[in-house]
């Protein structure tokens, strides 16, 4: 494998020419201007000081310019996501310049060596940008660096080294190992561009976190909590085939950031929204579905520029595949009394009925415990747009679904053999839609019957006062 890299990030490669033997110095970072959506097209290789390729490939000095930066690789060949991203950018921004930063010779190394090469690659990009800035009409403000994994930190270095400030850097699951907790000048950080937005899809609090856990941008978005991505479980990626390994799960979750970004480009009519929250647990409890004071934003390409004084962590749920958009609902259930609850938490399900569609039966995830004489908040989400909600069916699951719960029930029975039956009283459910920011209160169909017990269900209909709108802004999409 190529080892001798000079300070300029070049690799020596002896080429034997027909007439004379000579050593040609080949750049270890290449900039390929993708002029066409056609993958067969060779594009144009740009190099500092050479204006001809810019003319040959009709580089548009006044248009947006995207630099796509891949990450560490175990292969000498581009990974498939690159084609999808280039194609999506061409589809969405027809006049834009799309440049692939090919640093495979420096990335196809031991991970530690590739990490050490990120600075060199960042310098190369900065030099290219400095040279382009010398051209009339070229503006750094129109530059958008998109870096995946290790490439996100390369983008950070480029933004740090360039003369001036690039318009935007998008970090797609920035690499974690050797960057977690690092100094801001040694990783992607908010001061690397006018706007730095980040998608975190493979963060782990235990074991090795492939993606960085800490927030590193102006906005840091953690889809599905930033860890377990739907459709990436062993069962999903392996199907019935036994050939796969855990590597496929890692790739699926890590690469999900790229596909979420691609989705935002090609499915702009189905934007996904993320909501500001202090942590994943609070988001799972349904507490953070507000759009007040810039607390929500579109994810990916459509993200609105937010330059907060301090970093903003945002969360959302997604589908398992494109289009990734789901519809989030906050459900506030006031439990005003309960009887004989015992040790175990009830398992609740809701079904939402709307003007457009009805949801599947959705579990209410109890993050901590059901509180009595208190409002319990839950997050539920649907894959389809239900329209205006009409009614809700709340079901308390009967027979326990887990051995753990069965054991707890058995213990409960031993201590209270004549348990007269567990019961909860719920009068109303307040629902807030994350996507529309509309709030609605649902009351029990029969005001006299507010109790629910295991194996039973309770129906709620829209209360007479109907939709209540608070002065909360809806997360409208502002297309860049």
């Amino acid at each position: 494998s190529p080892v001798p890299f000079g300070p300029e990030g070049r690799l020596e490669d002896k080429l034997h020419k027909p007439k004379a033997t000579q050593t040609e110095v080949k750049p270890s970072v290449r900039f390929n201007l993708r002029t066409s959506k056609d993958p067969e097209h060779e594009g144009c290789y740009l190099s500092v000081g050479h204006s001809q390729p810019l003319e040959d490939c009709s580089f548009n000095m006044t248009a947006k310019t995207f630099f796509i930066i891949h990450g560490w690789t175990m292969s000498g060949i581009f990974e498939n996501w690159l084609h999808k991203l280039v194609s999506a950018l061409h589809t969405r921004e027809k006049d834009a310049n799309v440049v692939v930063v090919d640093w495979l010779p420096l990335a196809h190394q031991l991970y530690t060596d590739a990490v050490n090469n990120t600075r060199v690659v960042g310098h190369s990009i900065a030099r290219m940008l400095d040279w382009l800035q010398e051209k009339d009409d070229f503006s750094l403000g129109n530059v958008h660096l998109i870096g995946y994994s290790l490439g996100a930190h390369v983008a950070g270095y480029a933004g740090n080294f360039v003369k001036g400030t690039v318009g935007r850097i998008t970090g797609l699951d920035p690499a974690g190992p050797m960057f977690e907790g690092a100094d801001i000048h040694k990783r992607l950080s908010p001061d690397d561009a006018d706007f730095v937005d980040v998608l975190h899809t493979y963060t782990r609090s235990f074991g090795l976190s492939i993606g960085i856990q800490m927030p590193v941008g102006h906005i840091d978005i953690y889809p599905n909590g930033g860890d377990f991505q739907p459709g990436c479980g062993l069962n999903d990626v392996l199907g019935s085939i036994a050939y796969g390994t855990i590597t496929e799960v890692v790739k699926c979750e890590h690469e999900r950031a790229v596909h979420l970004f691609v989705d935002s480009l090609v499915n702009q009519d189905k934007p996904s929204f993320a909501f500001q929250c202090t942590d994943s647990n609070r988001f799972k409890k349904g507490i953070c579905l507000s759009c007040r004071k810039n607390r929500c934003n579109s994810i990916g390409y459509n993200a609105k520029k937010m330059r907060n004084k301090r970093n903003s962590k945002m969360y959302l749920k997604t589908r398992a595949g494109m289009p990734f958009r789901v519809y989030h609902y906050q459900m506030k259930i006031h439990v005003f009394s309960y009887k004989n609850m015992g040790e175990i938490e009830p398992t609740f399900y809701v079904t939402l009925y709307g003007t457009n569609a009805d949801s599947q039966t959705l579990p209410l995830e109890i993050v901590e415990r059901i509180e009595q004489n208190a409002t319990n908040t839950f997050l539920v989400y649907t894959e389809e747009d239900l329209g205006d909600l009409l009614k809700i069916q709340l079901t308390w699951e009967g027979a326990s679904q887990s051995w753990y719960n069965l054991w707890k029930e058995f213990r409960s029975y031993l201590s209270q053999p004549r348990n007269p039956g567990r019961e909860l009283n719920i009068r109303r459910i307040r629902v807030k839609s994350g996507e529309t920011q509309r709030k609605l209160t649902f009351c029990t169909e029969d005001p006299e019957n507010t109790s629910i017990s295991p194996g039973r269900e309770l129906w709620f209909r829209k209360c007479r006062d109907g939709w209540r709108m608070k002065n909360e802004t809806s997360p409208t999409v502002e297309l860049p």
Epitope: L11, G76, F78, S87, D236, G321
Partner: antibody, heavy 119, light 107 residues
Framework: QVQLVQSGAEVKKPGASVKVSCKAS????????MHWVRQAPGQRLEWMGG????????TYNEKFKDRVTITRDTSASTAYMELSSLRSEDTAVYYC????????????WGQGTTVTVSS | EIVMTQSPATLSVSPGERATLSCRAS??????LHWYQQKPGQAPRLLIK???QSISGIPARFSGSGSGTEFTLTISSLQSEDFAVYYC?????????FGQGTKLEIK
Amino acid sequence: QVQLVQSGAEVKKPGASVKVSCKASGYTFTDYTMHWVRQAPGQRLEWMGGINPYYGGTTYNEKFKDRVTITRDTSASTAYMELSSLRSEDTAVYYCAKGDYYGGSYNYWGQGTTVTVSS
Amino acid sequence: EIVMTQSPATLSVSPGERATLSCRASQDISNSLHWYQQKPGQAPRLLIKYASQSISGIPARFSGSGSGTEFTLTISSLQSEDFAVYYCQQSNSWPYTFGQGTKLEIK
């Protein structure tokens, strides 16, 4: 026009090695990946691996990883595929194929090299 | 490893008629699907790339569609030279894999 010309047919004994060459012309050899695909009689096509001729980085099918080596000589615009520890099941037609910029589809193929493994 | 399954194994169609060939992937491959034609004693020839992109020099009667796990190659009006074996190939993840082929024969 783009052309990929492969070396001639080979007959090998089990346990031996074979090295097939593929000379490219009509395009910049270092700008596109080169892949090797084989086809045993009556069987589906099987991707063996590929090389990035620009710097020599390779990717192999795990099935062949311990036995296949793909190399290139940029001065001769030629890619090579060497398969070792040959067995009768390796009897097949071996093709080189030029990848697109991303290495995903193969618009140009060599004429194929028949390798027969027989004792 | 992504397994590609083509159907039917053999398709008998009369010249001038329409032929529809199917290819299924064992998991989502987005649009990373390519179609090839192979005649006896010849190397495969690329017909369609990335599910639906046409190839210069390939007659317009060849078209591709699909995304995710289900893909289709359609030959709108069969010519005598179209009778051959057709393969699909995925490039979504390594190892790249091919289908077992569909033999298109004259009815």
